[in-house]
């Protein structure tokens, strides 16, 4: 129960806290368990004890082992154990599982990734952050105090995040890195009765005879992935495929987009070489999902060409 795993990389600073807590006034003695040899408190040593903290500045692979801390008070002694492992630096980008701190989950509402163990160190801002070994750039990422904030979190933001900072000890600087996995929680999505954003109900669209025209049917259905949602065009209440006019075609497939966090679909109707008879047709933008069907009707009108002679 009073044993704690700690790990670090060679040539980086590692600071370990005694698993047994006590008042600041209590003295804490540290020993190397295998030899029962006392850890010095003098700061000129590479490895030294400083109250509840054991400092490796910097750490070496040979430092690996179990360290005993004894918290001494006038009335009792408490013993704790720190199991320290120092690893060689990896040459490749991959961070092995044994170097990972606890996984954190984020969502659209809460996307803070705290830098593990940073409170043990004497560090100054800014923190550097890396995802899968690549430096994070762009306005979506904000290093704030001891954590990273990601704006508009997406599933693609999941991955291994490394924070890097400098620990200062008596004017000497030591690098520290810590890595943890970040997973993106699927915020509970919802679906609602379709809302058609375009076209407006009973819209009149001006077109030029002989030219091509495009009509876009765009609707939103809720938040998150939508199940059985569709947008489509009908001509005079008939499916485009059944209407039988090769000049008037619906785009293959529906384009998915996100508007203010809502899941939306749009479908483009392409009319080639607009003819007079196209102005007589009723164009219906239909949006449907499990909640029901919404329909907006559009009609075409002739755009008068500008008379350059007048």
């Amino acid at each position: 129960k009073f044993s704690k795993q700690s790990w670090g990389l060679e040539n980086e600073a590692l600071i370990v806290r005694c698993p047994r807590q006590g008042k600041p006034s209590y003295t804490v003695d540290w020993y190397y368990s295998q030899t029962n040899k006392s850890i010095p408190t003098q700061e000129r040593n590479r490895v030294f004890a400083s109250g509840q903290l054991l400092k490796f500045l910097p750490a070496a692979v040979a430092d690996s082992g179990i360290y005993t801390c004894i918290v001494r008070s006038p009335t009792f002694n408490r013993t704790g154990y720190a199991n320290v492992t120092i690893y060689k630096k990896q040459s490749d980008c991959n961070v092995p599982d044994y170097l990972m701190y606890s996984t954190v989950s984020g969502s659209e509402k809460n996307s803070k990734i705290y830098c593990p163990t940073i409170d043990l160190y004497n560090w100054t801002a800014p923190l550097e952050w890396f995802k899968n070994c690549q430096a994070l750039q762009g306005s979506r990422y904000r290093a704030h105090k001891s954590f990273l904030v990601i704006d508009n979190v997406m599933t693609e933001d999941a991955g291994d995040y490394t924070c890097k900072f400098i620990h200062n000890e008596n004017g000497a600087n030591y690098s520290v890195t810590a890595t943890r996995s970040f997973t993106v929680k699927d915020e509970q999505g919802f679906s609602l009765f379709p809302v058609i954003g375009a076209p407006a109900q009973n819209e009149i669209k001006e077109v030029e005879i002989g030219k091509n025209a495009n009509l876009t049917c765009s609707a939103c259905f809720g938040k998150g992935t939508q199940f059985l949602a569709a947008v489509l065009w009908q001509l005079n209440g008939t499916k485009i495929t059944d209407f039988g006019e090769p000049r008037i075609q619906q785009e293959e497939g529906q384009n998915q987009s996100f508007s203010n966090g809502l899941a939306c679909l749009d479908m483009v109707l392409r009319i080639a070489d607009v003819k007079e008879e196209d102005l007589l047709l009723q164009y219906d933008c239909l949006a449907l999902n499990l909640h029901g069907l919404r329909r907006h009707t559009v009609r075409l009108s002739r755009k008068n060409p500008i008379d350059h002679h007048s």
């Epitope: 992935t225 059985l228 569709a230 449907l288 499990l290 909640h291 029901g292 069907l293």
Partner: antibody, heavy 119, light 107 residues
Framework: EVQLLESGGGLVKPGGSLRLSCAAS????????MSWVRQAPGKGLEWVSA????????YYADSVKGRFTISLDDSKNTLYLQMNSLKTEDTAVYYC????????????WGQGTLVTVSS | DIQMTQSPSSLSASVGDRVTITCRAS??????LAWYQQKPGKAPKLLIY???SLQNGVPSRFSGSGSGTDFTLTISSLQPEDFATYYC?????????FGQGTKVEIK
Amino acid sequence: EVQLLESGGGLVKPGGSLRLSCAASGFTFSSYWMSWVRQAPGKGLEWVSAIGGSGAGTYYADSVKGRFTISLDDSKNTLYLQMNSLKTEDTAVYYCARLSTVTRGFDYWGQGTLVTVSS
Amino acid sequence: DIQMTQSPSSLSASVGDRVTITCRASQSISNWLAWYQQKPGKAPKLLIYSASSLQNGVPSRFSGSGSGTDFTLTISSLQPEDFATYYCQQSYSTPPTFGQGTKVEIK
């Protein structure tokens, strides 16, 4: 009481066509998405197609896209599946099923109709 | 498409046994999971929807749990009429997909 009754199954040669019907009663047909789900002999369930919004929106499994057409007749409360260019792997019991708008589960199923594609 | 994987594919149990069937989705499906029971020569029957809600008329010995990618169907005390094949199905995204089924047989 909600009831779904399929018909139209039978033996057909590869490349042939068949039209399945599903007569519905006991609910407002146009308010629900309807689906066809099939089950090959000794195999699991496979969703085939869905239709909603009084026949406006249609979806198909990749395995049947371009060959099968789902449609419905609101006035007759009947769902159809027109199957063209049939293949031996289309051999299955075909069920029509109602999709609950609330639970997104298939809450009512027909008894199924067997389609056998064989030369 | 989202893949649904059930385990085990078959199991033998006795009347009164507690039976657990698991279903795993290839990506998070929130709680949009249904469980069906199918007996030979019959159409499937909806047991559980939204991962844990019992469909009307289904005995309370059936229960479902889970969210995200891992789901469980539990029959607390197996009855003779429960020997059948059970399927999970996701309705998180189109197309809806089913697990391959778990056959519950008499030991």
